[in-house]
Amino acid sequence: NNHYDKILAHSRIRGRDQGPNVCALQQILGTKKKYFSTCKNWYKKSICGQKTTVLYECCPGYMRMEGMKGCPAVLPIDHVYGTLGIVGATTTQRYSDASKLREEIEGKGSFTYFAPSNEAWDNLDSDIRRGLESNVNVELLNALHSHMINKRMLTKDLKNGMIIPSMYNNLGLFINHYPNGVVTVNCARIIHGNQIATNGVVHVIDRVLTQIGTSIQDFIEAEDDLSSFRAAAITSDILEALGRDGHFTLFAPTNEAFEKLPRGVLERIMGDKVASEALMKYHILNTLQCSESIMGGAVFETLEGNTIEIGCDGDSITVNGIKMVNKKDIVTNNGVIHLIDQVLIPDSAKQVIELAGKQQTTFTDLVAQLGLASALRPDGEYTLLAPVNNAFSDDTLSMDQRLLKLILQNHILKVKVGLNELYNGQILETIGGKQLRVFVYRTAVCIENSCMEKGSKQGRNGAIHIFREIIKPAEKSLHEKLKQDKRFSTFLSLLEAADLKELLTQPGDWTLFVPTNDAFKGMTSEEKEILIRDKNALQNIILYHLTPGVFIGKGFEPGVTNILKTTQGSKIFLKEVNDTLLVNELKSKESDIMTTNGVIHVVDKLLYPA
């Protein structure tokens, strides 16, 4: 997992046209931030959504020679003190001299010096800097020793998750070595690594390391702006856990973030042990994610079990796509804290109705308007089968309110059923007392006539599944449906002539391909006569139109041929293309007509077995 070297190797490949030992770096436009080029960033030409420009520099350890291409020469080597000058960390060099550290790092030994760049010192709080400069023999020396290890450690030796004792009181240095090649020390990024010295190595870092003696718990307890979070963490028994050893990342909502919550939401969550613990754990990662490690969106699992997406937009960290981090990289002895101005509420702490997204607002508005929201009690468990907004036509919305309420009741189940609990043939009962059938296909899950879209969620008191269409529970059997529709009278008479009517009246699961009367218009009277005269042949043909099992066109993977075996024994080929069902390559005029014992697909030709 030597990611730094892998990324460096990629940068070398990108730079090899420029000569030996040349590395391609990407610099974020308008900043001094430079990164060795990852494959992803190279092609995206951006980092954190900011445009980058490509620079070609000598790879670490090499230098240019006049009149020669690339970087053919090895950089001069010196002791650690001299190397600080070679890498341009002249402020750190000057401070090393002033604090009498120079003698130590010029002499024999083997040291790793995480040397803050000149810019890093300039960015240090002026009061802290003055304090160090006014006590060079103790405070400054201690601060510099806290940037050092008494052993040469190249980036390949700096493994993710290591805690290395520094040369000041063995205070731990948190090492993170990320897959994108970023290496951080207490969240300071190594911006110029592996400058080898005769007595060790120098890594230039982008900030001055401040001493960290406290845990995340200590910080929360001391920080006034986290009093609401502190109270919530105590209530949910999470605070103590943040005092233990670990490599945590805490997204800590400030008091302002808690004030933004709608009235009653926090009270409800904090009054519920399970929900409050979920809320708190959703703000914690079990891995240490420094801001400098984030170069694009990545998904991380929280202690609560669900994931959050951490990304970046310029200098800002984003959480679930939103800029919300006020202060980043507060390093403690068991992790890092980022202060955020929003409370992150996991699904597991939400009421079922709160799980609905922007695409289900019509459904949730109707649930509220028609008085169904009050039926969803916090202590009960429900499942919402929420159709997307565009499933509701103007005709549906202008229906009689009582009728609309009945339709909506068909979209609320009496129990909590998660996506992984659904199975083919399952019967689900709605709060209106209707029974809905579940059909599970290779790439789709459908309930009655409507199939699910991605986005199922589970909340504190229920689950929500997203549907493409309004669910219409079947009322009539296959036979009743054929009788009711005049288009199918010819096929129905053939069914009766073949003595197969009974088959369509009994309970079961069938798929029936029904030719309209038009399908028979082109037939000669002789062909029709043959059909009726030879009962065996007729039965054969009719049974070819019937398949065991309910196969909904919308349940098929688009563009893929599905081979089904008919009751007659021969195969029939179905394919869904552009929302149209093809039956043996013939376009179905109408599909997915649901019945209590199956589904009808309408065709405009009589089908013959091969």
């Epitope: 130590e104 030994g109 080898i196 060790g200």
Partner: antibody, heavy 116, light 111 residues
């Protein structure tokens, strides 16, 4: 100047243990790792392991993990290596070496003889 | 573990002549433009003495007759001209990868 003092020799019986010492002077003991190297009679050199005197952290060569135990006493700036279950194979000169780039400072070595 | 193979195992060189000892590593000992190979001299009854560090840098107090060269896997220690006091065993040593390892040694005899 940097000095690493080791006793000249130790005679030990097979199956017994021995604790070798290495007293450091002339530098800040906790600022440098201490390494131990074995040299069998007429043989080459083998790295045994290292210890960080500031916190007692150790790294061992797999080969010596069960044979050697490294410790330090900061108050006396002394590093120790205990060798257990000694056999004739363990008869050798053992050096302590300060952890510089390139091992610049060596003790004089302790000759351990395992004999009944 | 990185294996260091020294050759020849022993050599006899006339006073004033050049002695060359090779050290071959089983894998590269280079990192960031530096070779983590070091050369020692050892005389009977004494601990090894550092001559050359990081493949080519002369340790302070060591005569300039000693020099080191090479990169990646192939390294050379050269003594030119050889003096009577140079009779000893010479070892190469790598610390690019843990565990650090030593070569088998090359015994130099002065004719």
């Amino acid at each position: 100047q940097v000095q690493l003092q080791q006793p000249g020799s130790e005679l030990v019986k097979p199956g017994a243990s021995v604790k070798l010492s290495c007293k450091a002077s002339g530098y800040t003991f906790t600022s440098y790792w201490m390494h131990w190297v074995k040299q069998s009679p007429g043989q080459g050199l083998e790295w045994i392991g290292e210890i960080n005197p500031s916190n007692g952290r150790t790294n061992y060569n797999e080969k010596f993990k069960t044979k050697a135990t490294l410790t330090v006493d900061k108050s006396s700036s002394t590093a120790y290596m205990q060798l257990n279950s000694l056999t004739s194979e363990d008869s050798a000169v053992y050096y302590c070496v300060r952890g510089d780039e390139g091992f610049a400072y060596w003790g004089q070595g302790t000759l351990v003889t395992v004999s009944a | 573990n990185i294996v260091l193979t020294q050759s020849p195992a022993s050599l006899a060189v006339s006073l004033g002549q050049r002695a060359t000892i090779s050290c071959s590593a089983s894998e590269s000992v280079d990192s960031y433009g530096r070779s983590f190979i070091h050369w020692f001299q050892q005389k009977p009854g004494q601990p090894p003495k550092l001559l050359i560090y990081l493949a080519s840098y002369l340790e302070s107090g060591v005569p300039a007759r000693f020099s080191g060269s090479g990169s990646r896997t192939d390294f050379t220690l050269t003594i030119d001209p050889v003096e009577a006091d140079d009779a000893a065993t010479y070892y190469c040593h790598q610390n690019n990868e843990d565990p650090p390892t030593f070569g088998g040694g090359a015994k130099l005899e002065i004719k």
